[in-house]
Each structure stands twice: as structure tokens, then as C-alpha cells.
């Protein structure tokens, strides 16, 4: 079986992980999307999800996780604010499309959070220890209980970010891509 590739992020406590899951196809625009953590030997666990149907540019907050789905731009923005060491782990974005299995949106993210004050010179103020300001309109969505075993056992081809190749709705590389933007390198 193909091994899933991972994108590694190394951040310090208090910083913000900021990723964009790029789904590109209009048919996915209003589908419910989720941010999951994958622990060794376990099924992916959904930590946060958008509403169903997903609302455009409407922030959903679950704890320190904020999801924003930009329908008109085919982007799901995921932010994990005020990172803690225990947030370290393997994450992924998926699109729920019952009764079909969820689509995984991009190569998994290996997040490594280390101790250390992030407010060093040149720091982005979004990533300091200060309380993160969330718009008052944020809501918490109910996430589906099921998680597809396929996201654990079946590895999709490596995503290559919008390369101009012939398209197939089965080949996930042509359905999605991602731009990963950590606040700090």
C-alpha cells in the first residue's frame, strides 16, 4: 500500500497553525468539512466541523480550533490557536459526503509543538500568548459520528497542487490541493 505523505510543521507554544485546505470543485462547496486528528492505531477523530450545509465564510469555533469555509473561493481555512505541546500529532481535513466515504483533502499534517515563548522579535502578533480574538458570530457545529475506515487504510495519490493534468473524479489529486501557511517557520 502507498504510504501517505506528511507535511511537517514545527511551531512553539502559543503560536497559531494556519492551513488552507483547497477543495476547488463547486460540488463540494456546501458539503460539511471536518478537521481530524489521527492517533496511532485508531480511527481518525473529528475535532471540529463546519455546519451542514456548510455556510460561507462563517467561522465555527470548537475550543481553540476555528474553521472558515470560503465557498466562493474553494477554501477551508483551519486555525489552531494558542498551540500547546499536547496538540502535537497528525491531522487531516476531510469533506463529508454521505452516503459516500469522506474525501481527504490533502497530505496529512504532522504538527510538532515545542515549549518556548513565541513572542520573540519579529513575531506575528497573531501568534503571541495573548487571547485570540474570535468574531462574535462563531458557532459550534454538530459533527457526524461516523469516520470512514478508508481514511486510515487507503492511501490516495500524493497531492500535487493544481497541476494541469487530465482530470478524474476518482483521482483525489485532481479534486483537491492545499497551500499550507504556518505563521512561523
Amino acid at each position: 500500500a502507498t504510504k501517505l505523505t506528511e507535511e511537517k510543521y514545527e511551531l512553539k507554544e502559543g503560536q497559531t497553525l494556519d492551513v488552507k485546505c483547497d477543495y476547488t470543485l463547486e460540488k463540494f462547496a456546501s458539503s460539511q468539512k471536518a478537521w481530524q486528528i489521527i492517533r496511532d492505531g485508531e480511527m481518525p477523530k473529528t475535532l471540529a466541523c463546519t455546519e451542514r450545509p456548510s455556510k460561507n465564510s462563517h467561522p465555527v469555533q470548537v475550543g481553540r480550533i476555528i474553521l472558515e469555509d470560503y465557498h466562493d473561493h474553494g477554501l477551508l481555512r483551519v486555525r489552531m490557536v494558542n498551540l500547546q505541546v499536547e496538540d502535537s500529532g497528525l491531522y487531516q481535513c476531510v469533506i463529508y459526503q454521505p452516503p459516500k466515504e469522506p474525501h481527504m483533502l490533502f497530505d496529512r499534517i504532522r504538527l510538532v509543538v515545542t515549549k518556548g515563548f513565541s513572542g520573540t522579535p519579529g513575531s506575528n502578533e497573531n501568534s503571541t500568548q495573548n487571547v485570540y480574538k474570535i468574531p462574535p458570530t462563531t458557532t459550534k457545529a454538530l459533527c457526524p459520528l461516523y469516520t470512514s475506515p478508508r481514511t486510515v487504510t487507503q492511501a490516495p495519490p500524493k497531492s500535487t497542487a493544481d497541476v494541469s493534468t487530465p482530470d478524474s473524479e476518482i483521482n483525489l489529486t485532481n479534486v483537491t490541493d492545499i497551500i499550507r501557511v504556518p505563521v512561523f517557520n
Epitope: H73, G74, D162
Partner: antibody, heavy 121, light 111 residues
């Protein structure tokens, strides 16, 4: 291989009408928005408009210069996009390109070779 | 409408030298810190060819002497070492808002 082939261009008098076609192959046509871009001789590129997919109710958007005169449509069963041009003006004379993006508001990765429309009396 | 203004209108650069083309938008073309600004190359008698998408991503098959940078309203296309086959007109284009718009084009020639 993705291919876009425009047809229907030609000479038409001011005030007249013309319908351009864009035959697509090599990809799942119904999944992508289709666009028209034009270029007058020796001039720059001008986006004409786009039509979205069934998921977006085939919504259309146009440049101000053609709004109310041009209509974009599509027939997913024929893998074809259309540009209906009415009340044509001499300034509409251009090569018209059909293009396909890479998804929602993404870049134009695929272009046809273009078809020439000449509006002249 | 978002107006894209390219500078210069024309540019003459020696073979092997660096060429830089700028594109300024009348308002931001970013959504969620993601720039919907693309660069195309067009040679006479041909349709445009995609070079750079979303400000800085090199299209597959495009030589790596081409690069793009910028965000918000200011963007740059750079050719690190000009080759004879790079003589063309270059356009920036935004897809962040309808109507989509193109810059007026920059003609690149060899000095």
C-alpha cells in the same frame, strides 16, 4: 489530454448576432466552470465571462462591456459551452478564446486556439 | 472592478539577465491570505500559457527561471536569466472577484 476547440466565428454586421461554441474533451466537463476571453488585434486580453456548474445553478457572470448583450450557456451532455453574442459592435471584433479553470476561482490552465469574430459593415 | 496595472509596458533585457514585471491591483486580490493572482505568457499567434498561479506557484512544465511573488495588491513576475524563447507579452490576471480582470500586458524583448 484536455482539449478546447472553438468554432462559429466569422464576419457579421454591426447589430447582428453570432453564436460561438467550445467543444471540450479530455476531462469531466460538468465539473468545471467555463470562461470566454477575447483579444482584439494587437491589444490585451479581456475576460468576457464565465458559467459555473450545475452545483452552482449554472450561474453566469459577465464583463461590463458585454453585459446584456452576450449570454454564456453550456450543455453538459454535449461537453460544450456557448457564447451567444447579440447587438454586436465593431469594438467586439477580436479573437475569442474558450478557457477552463482549475476549480473555483482558480487559474486558466487550458485554452482553446481561439476563433476570430469580425464585426464590420 | 479590480484594475490591474502592469509596469513597465515594455521591457528590453539582455540575454542571461534578470527581467522583472510588476502588477499592482486597485484593491486586494487575497482571500484568507491566499492570493488569486496569476501570470500568463503569450507569443504571437498563440493562446496565452499559464506560468504562475496564485502569485507564486510554478505551473507544471514551466522552467524554474520563472518565479512569482507578492500578496494583497503588489505582485512581481521574475525571469532570473532571460532566454531567447522568453520574448513574449506577459499578463497578470485576478480571479478573486467578478469580473475577472487582466493587466494591460508587458512586452518583453531582448536588448
Amino acid at each position: 489530454e484536455v482539449q478546447l476547440v472553438e468554432s462559429g466565428g466569422g464576419l457579421v454586421q454591426p447589430g447582428g448576432s453570432l453564436k460561438l461554441s467550445c467543444a471540450a474533451s479530455g476531462f469531466t466537463f460538468s465539473t468545471y466552470a467555463m470562461h470566454w476571453v477575447r483579444q482584439a488585434s494587437g491589444k490585451g486580453l479581456e475576460w468576457v465571462g464565465r458559467i459555473r456548474t450545475k452545483s452552482s445553478n449554472y450561474a453566469t457572470y459577465y464583463a461590463a462591456s458585454v453585459k446584456g448583450r452576450f449570454t454564456i450557456s453550456r450543455d453538459d451532455s454535449k461537453n460544450t459551452a456557448y457564447l451567444q453574442m447579440n447587438s454586436l459592435k465593431t469594438e467586439d471584433t477580436a479573437v475569442y478564446y474558450c478557457t477552463r479553470d482549475m476549480g473555483i476561482r482558480r487559474q486558466f490552465a487550458y485554452w482553446g486556439q481561439g476563433t476570430l469574430v469580425t464585426v464590420s459593415s | 472592478d479590480i484594475v490591474l496595472t502592469q509596469s513597465p509596458d515594455s521591457l528590453a533585457v539582455s540575454l542571461g539577465e534578470r527581467a522583472t514585471i510588476n502588477c499592482r491591483a486597485s484593491e486586494s486580490v487575497d482571500t484568507a491570505d491566499y492570493s488569486f493572482l496569476h501570470w500568463y505568457q503569450q507569443k504571437p499567434g498563440q493562446p496565452p500559457k499559464l506560468l504562475i498561479y496564485r502569485a507564486s506557484n510554478l505551473e507544471s512544465g514551466v522552467p524554474d527561471r520563472f518565479s512569482g511573488s507578492g500578496s494583497g495588491t503588489d505582485f512581481t513576475l521574475t525571469i532570473s536569466s532571460l532566454q531567447a524563447e522568453d520574448v513574449a507579452v506577459y499578463y497578470c490576471q485576478q480571479s478573486n472577484e467578478d469580473p475577472y480582470t487582466f493587466g494591460q500586458g508587458t512586452k518583453l524583448e531582448i536588448k
